[in-house]
C-alpha cells in the first residue's frame, strides 16, 4: 500500500522520488523512478541489490516495472545529513564511531564484490537507530551509480561535487575503489565536525569541490572546534591522500576503525624534544583548567613544566639543582589554594603555589633523594587531618601535616625509619577498596608495609620468594610500585611479572606474567624474540581503575589491561610508545574521568653520531577503554553472525 502524496514523501533525486509505504505489514521505502529513467538504471540497481546481502547495505524487498519502482527497508531515523543538520546533540563519540564503522563495513563488502559505490556522502547513509551498541545503526543506500569494476578501473565522472575524490572530479581519468576511500575520508571528516563543511558548502557551492580536491580541508579541531580525536584525524588524513595508491583500502579502513583504542584515545600531545618527564600530577578536578604538572630534568637540574590540556599550551621552568623525581598536589580547601610539591634527587622539597608561581619555598631537606610523594585524603568527610607523605631513598617516611606546606622550612611531624640505603621507599598508595579507606600501603626494598592515620606500621610483608622460579632472579629486586584493592599488586625493578599478594594471609596468590601475555599477542604477529620480550615486558608502572581493570605499563612501550574480577587479559595495546613511564587516573574538568599515560619515544637523530633523541608523549584515554574493548568485541561478533545469516539466506 502506498500513496504518492506529499506527506509520505521521504526524498527527491534526479532518478525520481522515495515514499514511505506499507508492504506485507511492514513500513518500507518505495523508490519510484521517473518515467524517462532508463530501464538500464533500474536493472543496474536491481543487479546490485539482488546479489548483495550485508548488514550495512539497504535490503531490497521487492521490485516493479510499471511503474518502475524498488521496495526497500525503511530507515526510521532518516539520513545522516539530516542528523548532522538537525540533531547534532545525538552524535556522541561512540555513535560517531559506530556509524563510521558500519559504513566502512558496507564499503569493504561492496569492494570485495568488485563494486565501486561512487556516491558516498551523508545523504546516502541511512540510520536505523541512535543507540550505539545496536547491531544495525547505519546502512549505505542508493545504488544508482554503483558500478562493477574490472582490475583496470573505470573512467566516467560521477558522484556528487564536494563528496568525491579528485580523480573522479577531474573526469577522463581511470579510477577504482580507492575513490570511495577518499569519499569515506570526507564522510569521516563530516561526522567528526558534525557537518560544518557541508553548511559552508551550501553557501559557496562553486568552491565546494575545490577545497578537498586540492587537499585544502581545514583542520577539523581548530576550524570547527570539535574535540580532538587523534586516531580518527590520522585516518582522515590517510584517506584523503592525493595519490589513490597511498590511501588505505576499505578493508584496512575497517580494521583501523575496529579498535577500542581508536574510540578511547582522546588526546595525544608531544612534548618538546629531550624533555625527560619523570613524574606528573593533574590539577584538582574542581579547577577550571584541565591541566597537568610535569616533573622533568637531568642530573644537574630539575624542570617543572605546566601543560594546559585545553589549549595544549606548555610552559617550563628550571626550579631545582637536580632531577625532580616525584610530584604531589596538596589541596587546602579552607584556604582555597593548592600547592605543587616537587621531590628532587638531592632531597629538596620545593613547594610552589599553583595560582601564583612566585609564591614558592622549600621545606626541611630530606636526608636522601625524595623517591615518592603522596598527599592522602583520610579526611574527606571527617575532621581528621590530611598529610603529605614523603618517601626517601634511604628508606625513611616523613610525615608533614598538609597545612604546613605553606610554611618555609617546615619540618615533618614524624619520621619513620622503615628501610635503609639499600632498601629505598619507592612507592606509596591508598587502597581503592572502600572497606579500608584509612589504610595506606607502601613498598620499601622487597617489603610491603601498611599503616593507618596514627602512622604506626600495621603490616610488614616480605615479598622475597623463590616461588617465582622461572623469574626467581627478580624476586630479590626492590619494589618500584604498589597498587591496592582487595589484593596487593606489586612490580619490582626490571621484572616482567606483577606479583599479586593476599592482604589477609600475607601470601603470594598469583603472578601476572607480562611476557606470556605479550607473547600471546606477538606469536600471531611474529614480532619479538623471547629475550627481547622479557626486556620489553619489564613493568614500569601500574594503575588501578577501581572495580574494573589493572593497567600495566611496560618498559617496551606496551600497555596491558587486566580484568580485576576474572584476572583475564582484556587487551594489549602493543608498541604504544618506546617506553611507558607514568600512568594515573584523573578527573579533569570537562574531560571527566580519564587515564593519563606518559611515555617516551626514542628517535635516531640525523648526523654522524647516532644519538637517540627522547620525546615524551602524553596521552589522554577515556576511562571506559576496558568496557569499550568488550562492547566492541561483542558488537563485531553480533554483526558477523548477522552477515553470515544474511549470506546463507541469500544462497537459499
Amino acid at each position: 500500500e502506498f500513496e504518492q502524496a506529499p506527506e509520505f514523501l521521504l526524498g527527491d533525486g534526479s532518478f525520481g522520488s522515495v515514499y514511505r509505504a506499507a508492504y506485507e505489514g511492514e513500513e518500507v521505502a518505495v523508490k519510484i523512478f521517473n518515467k524517462h529513467t532508463s530501464l538500464r538504471l533500474l536493472r543496474q540497481e536491481l543487479v546490485v541489490l539482488c546479489h548483495l546481502h550485508h548488514p550495512s547495505l539497504i535490503s531490497l524487498l521487492a521490485a516493479g516495472i510499471r511503474p518502475r519502482m524498488l521496495v526497500m527497508e525503511l530507515a526510521s531515523k532518516g539520513s545522516l545529513d539530516r542528523l548532522l543538520q538537525q540533531d547534532k546533540a545525538s552524535l556522541t563519540r561512540t555513535l560517531q564511531h559506530r556509524i563510521a564503522l558500519h559504513v566502512a563495513d558496507g564499503l569493504r563488502y561492496l569492494h570485495s564484490a568488485m563494486i565501486i559505490y561512487r556516491d558516498l556522502k551523508p545523504h546516502n547513509v541511512l540510520l536505523f537507530t541512535l543507540y550505539p551498541n545496536a547491531a544495525i545503526i547505519a546502512k549505505i543506500a542508493d545504488y544508482g551509480i554503483a558500478q562493477y569494476c574490472c582490475r583496470m578501473g573505470i573512467k566516467t565522472s560521477e558522484g556528487t561535487p564536494g563528496f568525491r575524490a579528485p580523480e573522479v572530479a577531474r573526469g577522463n581519468v581511470i579510477y577504482n575503489q580507492q575513490a570511495d576511500v577518499y569519499s569515506f575520508g570526507l564522510l569521516l571528516y563530516d561526522i567528526l565536525t558534525t557537518g560544518g563543511r557541508i553548511v559552508e558548502g551550501l553557501k559557496f557551492p562553486n568552491e565546494f569541490d575545490e577545497l578537498e580536491i586540492q587537499g585544502k580541508l581545514p583542520d577539523p579541531v581548530k576550524e570547527y572546534g570539535c574535540a580532538p580525536w587523534p586516531m580518527v584525524e590520522k585516518l582522515i588524513k590517510q584517506c584523503l591522500k592525493e595519490n589513490p595508491q597511498e590511501r588505505p583500502t576499505s578493508a584496512q579502513v575497517f580494521d583501523i576503525l575496529n579498535s577500542a583504542e581508536l574510540v578511547c584515545l582522546t588526546r595525544r600531545i608531544l612534548l618538546p624534544k629531550n624533555v625527560i618527564v619523570e613524574c606528573m600530577v593533574a590539577t584538582h578536578h574542581n579547577s577550571r583548567n584541565a591541566s597537568i604538572w610535569l616533573g622533568c630534568g637531568h642530573t644537574d637540574r630539575g624542570q617543572l613544566s605546566f601543560l594546559d590540556l585545553n589549549t595544549e599550551g606548555y610552559t617550563s621552568e628550571e626550579v631545582a639543582d637536580s632531577r625532580i623525581l616525584c610530584l604531589a598536589l596538596v589541596h587546602l580547601p579552607v584556604e582555597k589554594e593548592s600547592w605543587i610539591v616537587s621531590g628532587t634527587q638531592s632531597g629538596t622539597l620545593l613547594v610552589i603555589n599553583t595560582e601564583d608561581g612566585k609564591k614558592r619555598h622549600t621545606l626541611e631537606k630530606m636526608t636522601d633523594s625524595v623517591t615518592c610523594l603522596y598527599c592522602n585524603s583520610f579526611s574527606k568527610q571527617s575532621k581528621q587531618k590530611n598529610f603529605l607523605l614523603v618517601g626517601t631513598a634511604d628508606g625513611k617516611l616523613a610525615i608533614f601535616e598538609d597545612k604546613t606546606v605553606k610554611l618555609k622550612g617546615a619540618a615533618p611531624l614524624k619520621i619513620l625509619n622503615i628501610g635503609n640505603v639499600s632498601t629505598p621507599l619507592m612507592c606509596l598508595s591508598e587502597s581503592t577498596n572502600s572497606t579500608e579507606r584509612n589504610v595506606m600501603w607502601g613498598g620499601c626494598g622487597t617489603k610491603i608495609f601498611s599503616f593507618s592515620n596514627d602512622f604506626t606500621i600495621q603490616k610488614l610483608i616480605e615479598t622475597r620468594t623463590s616461588q617465582l622460579f622461572s623469574y626467581a632472579a627478580f624476586s630479590d629486586s626492590n619494589i618500584i610500585t604498589v597498587v591496592v584493592d582487595t589484593a596487593l599488586y606489586i612490580a619490582k625493578q626490571n621484572s616482567p611479572v606483577v606479583e599479586v599478594w593476599d592482604k589477609k594471609t600475607e601470601k603470594l596468590c598469583g603472578l601476572i606474567d607480562c611476557v606470556h601475555f605479550l607473547r600471546e599477542v606477538t606469536v600471531k604477529e611474529n614480532k619479538e624474540s623471547k629475550h627481547k620480550m622479557s626486556y620489553s615486558g619489564r613493568v614500569k608502572t601500574l594503575c588501578l581503575q577501581k572495580n574494573t581493570a589493572l593497567w600495566i605499563g611496560t618498559g617496551g612501550g606496551h600497555i596491558l589491561l587486566l580484568d580485576l574480577s576474572t584476572r583475564r587479559l582484556i587487551r594489549v595495546i602493543y608498541n604504544f610508545c618506546n617506553s611507558v613511564r607514568v600512568m594515573m587516573t584523573a578527573q579533569l574538568g570537562s574531560l571527566k574521568n580519564v587515564m593519563l599515560v606518559l611515555g617516551y619515544n626514542r628517535k635516531n637523530t640525523e648526523g654522524t653520531q647516532k644519538q637517540k633523541e627522547i620525546q615524551s608523549c602524553l596521552t589522554v584515554w577515556d576511562i571506559n577503554l576496558p568496557h569499550e574493548v568488550q562492547n566492541l568485541e561483542k558488537h563485531i561478533e553480533v554483526r558477523k553472525e548477522l552477515a553470515e545469516k544474511m549470506r546463507r539466506t541469500s544462497v537459499e
Partner: nanobody
Framework: QVQLVESGGGLVQAGGSLRLSCAAS????????MGWFRQAPGKEREFVAA????????YYADSVKGRFTISRDNAKNTVYLQMNSLKPEDTAVYYC??????????????????WGKGTQVTVSS
C-alpha cells in the same frame, strides 16, 4: 567439559619418592596453566607447583623447591609431579587443577577453573 584425573598417590616412607600424574581431557590446553595443590587434615589448601602448558615455565612453593619437579607431556595431555626426599609434613591429599587465564598464574586455589578429585599421599616416619 574439562576433566582432570589424578593418580600415583600412596603410602611411602620418609626420604622416599612418588610420581603423581594428572590426565587432562575435554579441551585444548595450550593456553592453560596446570597446578598441583595439597590439603593436609585440618589445614587450608596450599599451592605446591604450577607449569605453563605452552612454554613450560614452572613455579614452586618455597616448601617443596628443590625436592619436587613439575613437568608435562603434551602428547599425552598429562602433567606430572615428581616428589623426592618426601617428609611427613608432605602428607596430604594432592589435587590437580587447571586455569585458563593466559599469563595469570594462580598460586592460590581461588583462581583455578577446574579441579580433579585428588589423590592421597601419606609419608610415614
Amino acid at each position: 567439559q574439562v576433566q582432570l584425573v589424578e593418580s600415583g598417590g600412596g603410602l611411602v616412607q620418609a626420604g622416599g619418592s612418588l610420581r603423581l600424574s594428572c590426565a587432562a581431557s575435554g579441551r585444548t590446553f595450550s593456553s592453560y596453566t596446570m597446578g598441583w595443590f595439597r590439603q593436609a587434615p585440618g589445614k587450608e589448601r596450599e599451592f605446591v607447583a604450577a607449569i605453563r602448558w605452552s612454554g613450560g615455565s614452572t613455579y614452586y612453593a618455597d616448601s617443596v623447591k628443590g625436592r619436587f619437579t613439575i613437568s608435562r607431556d603434551n602428547a599425552k595431555n598429562t602433567v606430572y609431579l615428581q616428589m623426592n626426599s618426601l617428609k611427613p609434613e608432605d602428607t596430604a591429599v594432592y589435587y590437580c587443577a587447571a586455569s585458563d587465564r593466559g599469563g595469570f598464574i594462580a598460586t592460590s586455589g581461588g583462581w583455578m577453573d577446574y579441579w580433579g578429585k585428588g589423590t592421597q599421599v601419606t609419608v610415614s616416619s
